[in-house]
């Protein structure tokens, strides 16, 4: 269940994708990743109000405990939902090799 | 792929699974849930430091990012890796009935 | 990118060149030596990553040892033959072809 | 190992003119593009002029533009200036390590 999209923080301050640029030395790939040079990595960025975006059961619960417990229960956290694919071209101990990695770019945000 | 289990900042503190005692009333069900009338709620709480329990590629990027780029990029966050099932007596319109959730309760925890 | 002097040495007397740098740092860049036989082409010997570990290509058959520290990128001449004899280029880059090389230092290797 | 054939040399050019020199490999190189061109002149090390292929190097100028994918590539120079009589290699980067290196190499004269 994907509850409310509208946020009440204002514009762009609740989770969302961000997209950050990093160069393979940011990332500590230098070594064992050729290219890309520099990747343009999306992120789950922003503050998981009440019920806005919420994933789950699980992250209705935890809105509904924070607020009650806020020094025991931290909110929902914005979190990838969905990933888009990437491939790197790696270094291997003979040589180079493709990989695809379907966890490294995130598609979609939720909080959780 | 999941980094180490070893918490850097002290027993317990990093992140793992917590059980948190809620009522119906806590929880805002009491006008539809009519069983069970508090629920053990098993959440995914505490820090997640470099490499710690790293879900995936990307909570790993995260690490190396929020490392460089802390007031941009948050630290990655402890939440449910998987789910156990709960069973709910609900209200119906007409009576009552059983209700699988699949997503309330966390089983496993990761960073992410 | 410059390579120490080079010199006259005798067949199977181990030679090692060194390639300092200056303007970038060498544990950010891939960095690679390439030498040329008087009035011939260029010959790639190999690579060194970042951290690091050294690659090589095939004619090389571990005749050659390329090593890094923090500040220095060394190439080991380990049995050198008077095939061996040419100008050692040290250059940075590896994939993106190689954009800063050193004026080359002359090897000559005779009895 | 990889057989990387250049244009035979020499290659003679008239400045104003336009010269083109092609790089055949018995391969591919890595992500079809892995390639770079490099000119260089009598008791100087190479210069980095296009990698990737077709990107020009920085402080490279136009004149020299780089094509081509997979196996087969091309270096043109328009307007050829008196200062572009070098000899030209190229160099490809491939899946296995020891098949990397160079062209024999295309010498370029400007009449």
């Known amino acids: 269940a994907r509850n409310g999209d509208h946020c009440p923080l204002g514009p762009g301050r609740c989770c969302r994708l961000h997209t950050v640029r990093a160069s393979l030395e940011d990332l500590g790939w230098a070594d064992w990743v050729l290219s890309p040079r520099e990747v343009q990595v999306t992120m789950c960025i922003g503050a998981c109000p009440s019920q806005f975006r919420a994933a789950n059961m699980h992250a209705q619960i935890k809105t509904s405990l924070h607020r009650l417990k806020p020094d025991t229960v931290p909110a929902p956290c914005c979190v990838p939902a969905s990933y888009n694919p990437m491939v790197l071209i790696q270094k291997t101990d003979t040589g180079v090799s493709l990989q695809t990695y379907d966890d490294l770019l995130a598609k979609d945000c939720h909080c959780i | 792929a999941r980094n180490g289990d070893h918490c850097p900042l002290g027993p317990g503190r990093c992140c793992r699974l917590h059980t948190v005692r809620a009522s119906l009333e806590d929880l805002g069900w009491a006008d539809w849930v009519l069983s069970p009338r508090e629920v053990q709620v098993t959440m995914c709480i505490g820090a997640c430091p470099s490499q710690f329990r790293a879900a995936n590629m990307h909570a790993q990027i995260k690490t190396s990012l929020h490392r460089l780029k802390p007031d941009t990029v948050p630290a990655p966050c402890c939440v449910p890796a998987s789910y156990n099932p709960m069973v709910l007596i609900q209200k119906t319109d007409t009576g009552v009935s059983l209700q699988t959730y699949d997503d309330l309760l966390a089983k496993d925890c990761h960073c992410i | 990118v410059k390579e120490s002097e080079g010199r006259l040495v005798t067949p199977g007397t181990p030679l090692t060149l060194t390639c300092t740098a200056s303007?970038?740092?060498?544990?950010?860049?891939?960095m690679s030596w390439v030498r040329q036989a008087p009035g011939k082409g260029l010959e790639w010997i190999g690579f060194?990553?970042?951290?690091?570990r050294a690659y090589y290509t095939s004619w090389v058959n571990g005749r050659f040892t390329i090593s890094k520290t923090s500040t220095t990128v060394d190439l080991k001449i380990t049995s050198p033959t008077t095939e061996d004899t040419a100008t050692y280029f040290c250059a940075r880059g590896y994939t993106s072809g190689l954009d800063i090389w050193g004026p080359g230092t002359l090897v000559t290797v005779s009895s | 190992a990889i057989d990387m054939t250049q244009t035979p040399s020499p290659v003679s050019a008239t400045v104003g003119g336009t010269v083109t020199i092609s790089c055949q490999s018995s391969k591919s190189v890595v992500n079809g593009d892995w390639l770079a061109w490099y000119q260089q002149k009598p008791g100087q090390p190479p210069k980095l002029l296009i990698y990737?292929?077709?990107t020009l190097a920085s402080g490279v100028p136009s004149r020299f533009k780089g094509s081509g994918s997979g196996t087969q590539f091309t270096l043109t120079i328009s307007d050829v200036q008196c200062a572009d009589a070098a000899t030209y290699y190229c160099?490809?980067?491939?899946?296995?390590?020891?098949?990397?290196?160079f062209g024999g190499g295309t010498e370029v004269v400007v009449k």
């Open positions: 303007g970038f740092s060498l544990s950010s860049h891939w």
């Open positions: 990737d292929a077709a």
């Open positions: 060194v990553s970042p951290s690091g």
């Open positions: 160099a490809g980067v491939y899946n296995n390590d020891s098949d990397n290196g």
